[in-house]
């Protein structure tokens, strides 16, 4: 708390300008009117106030708006935003994408802070869903944003927003998140032709089921090994050697280097060795010739 002291004669601020930068804490508190500050917030960012001075300015705004700042002030907070706590931000009602962009710009270069996370949460909840423009903005500032959401939160992303997603935005997504995103992507890109469709859907394939992988294998897509290694193990296991060969095309040779890693390792264990031998890659660990493979889960279902 800054103690209340009278403003020295001649120091009363008539506007927010650069003459204030050498005001001491108590002088700022005593000589700057909160209402003046609120109407001239856009000027604060053009003046090199120190952190200590920004604390005083924030304190003045807090006193003026105890229930939370109006959006007209929030939009012009600039570097004062870095002084806000999540508790402060929870009092705000931010509806304008321009306001969101302005505040994210201030935080650019920093990792996503609790303040930014709270701001985004307030904004998205206010909008009701993660629309394309919002997603576009958020992933531009924070490529990992999408993967920071829970599967439940991702379920509110409309398929139309998927167009804004870039491959790098999905780098840190886990299988549960891709399970939610993949059907949306499939819907979003459904009207594209084969090769264009594959380019767009590729980064979402970690959520694809077996039947979709089988369908892709018929389309000469030449999936790279990096994508193949991110596929769900349970989706890869039922694929035949011929299907995997068609799916990977010339990249099939890369299986040898990955034979000890999932899902390749588990897939090899499910294939007949003589089928694997047809690839000519020296893959070992398949089911020896002459052995009968019983699918116990199928047997249980029949009984």
């Amino acid at each position: 708390e800054v103690e209340k002291t009278a403003c020295p004669s001649g120091k009363k601020a008539r506007e927010i300008d650069e003459s204030l930068i050498f005001y001491k804490k108590w002088e700022l508190e005593a000589c700057v009117d909160a209402a003046l500050l609120a109407t001239q917030m856009d000027r604060v960012n053009a003046i090199p106030f120190t952190y200590e001075q920004l604390d005083v300015l924030k304190h003045k705004l807090d006193e003026l708006y105890p229930q939370g700042y109006p959006e007209s002030v929030i939009q012009h907070l600039g570097y004062l935003f870095l002084k806000m706590s999540p508790e402060d931000i929870r009092k705000w009602n931010v509806t304008s994408l321009e306001t969101l962009k302005a505040l994210l710009e201030v935080n650019k270069g920093h990792e996503m802070s609790p303040q930014v996370a709270t701001l985004i949460d307030r904004f998205v909840k206010g909008r009701g869903q993660l629309d394309k423009d919002t997603l576009d903005t958020l992933t531009a500032f924070y490529p990992g944003y999408l993967c920071s959401l829970s599967p439940e939160e991702l379920s509110s992303v409309p398929p139309s927003s998927i167009w804004a997603v870039r491959p790098q935005d999905l780098d840190t997504c886990d299988p549960r998140q891709l399970d939610v995103l993949y059907p949306k992507a499939r819907l979003a890109f459904q009207n594209m032709n084969g090769s264009e469709y594959f380019v767009k859907i590729q980064s979402f394939l970690g959520g694809a089921p077996t039947e979709d992988l089988k369908a892709l294998s018929q389309q000469n897509v030449s999936m790279d090994l990096a994508t193949f290694m991110k596929l769900r193990t349970d989706a890869v296991l039922p694929l035949t050697v011929a299907e995997v060969q068609k799916l990977l095309g010339p990249h099939v040779e890369g299986l040898k280097a990955e034979e000890r890693h999932r899902p390749v390792r588990d897939w090899i264990l499910r294939q007949r060795q003589d089928d694997l031998d047809t690839l000519g890659l020296g893959l070992q660990g398949g089911i020896p010739n002459g052995y009968l493979v019983l699918d116990l889960s199928m047997q249980e279902a029949l009984s």
Partner: antibody, heavy 120, light 106 residues
Framework: QVQLVESGGGLVKPGGSLRLSCAAS????????MSWIRQAPGKGLEWVSY????????YYADSVKGRFTISRDNAKNSLYLQMNSLRAEDTAVYYC?????????????WGQGTLVTVSS | IQLTQSPSSLSASVGDRVTITCRAS??????LAWYQQKPGKAPKLLIY???SLESGVPSRFSGSGSGTDFTLTISSLQPEDFATYYC?????????FGGGTKVEIK
Amino acid sequence: QVQLVESGGGLVKPGGSLRLSCAASGFTFSDYYMSWIRQAPGKGLEWVSYISSSGSTIYYADSVKGRFTISRDNAKNSLYLQMNSLRAEDTAVYYCASPYKKRRTVFDYWGQGTLVTVSS
Amino acid sequence: IQLTQSPSSLSASVGDRVTITCRASQGISSALAWYQQKPGKAPKLLIYDASSLESGVPSRFSGSGSGTDFTLTISSLQPEDFATYYCQQFNSYPLTFGGGTKVEIK
């Protein structure tokens, strides 16, 4: 890209005067607050003087107050430091420095420095 | 506000983890920057806001701390890292620098 080039340094006798200049390019000079920072031989950095973008707000370290005058000419993209009544302890490399617009109290851009030697 | 850096110099080898500290005479929140200076060159900004890496600075540099005690860490010292490092506070005017820490080759 941003460039700051100092000039005007040299050898001067105690009590003498020098005028340092800093030519700025690669950014909108008139938007930026500018500083002079010095470094005595083998010593640390000292913030000497500071001028606001319009030139109306100025700061001097106590060690140079009353002897040094900072000014700027936004039309010429130039910053100046007039140094009078020079003392041996003013011997230093003088840097002109500018903050990146959004973080105005740290110094992202520095010139190569100009050496001022005060000696009889 | 006075900033005291320690040690004033240190000797280390390539690959070493190096830690430099900066102590402020009073609390400065996270308003601290770190600079690197090589002989005959101007200082170069490495870190601002105590822990935010300036763009283009290698990730082996990191900063931490808040209040009065701050640390600059170089996780694996490289040949080009031998230099003098300075801290600077921007919590209040006048802006001040620490005395510097010289990192030398062992």
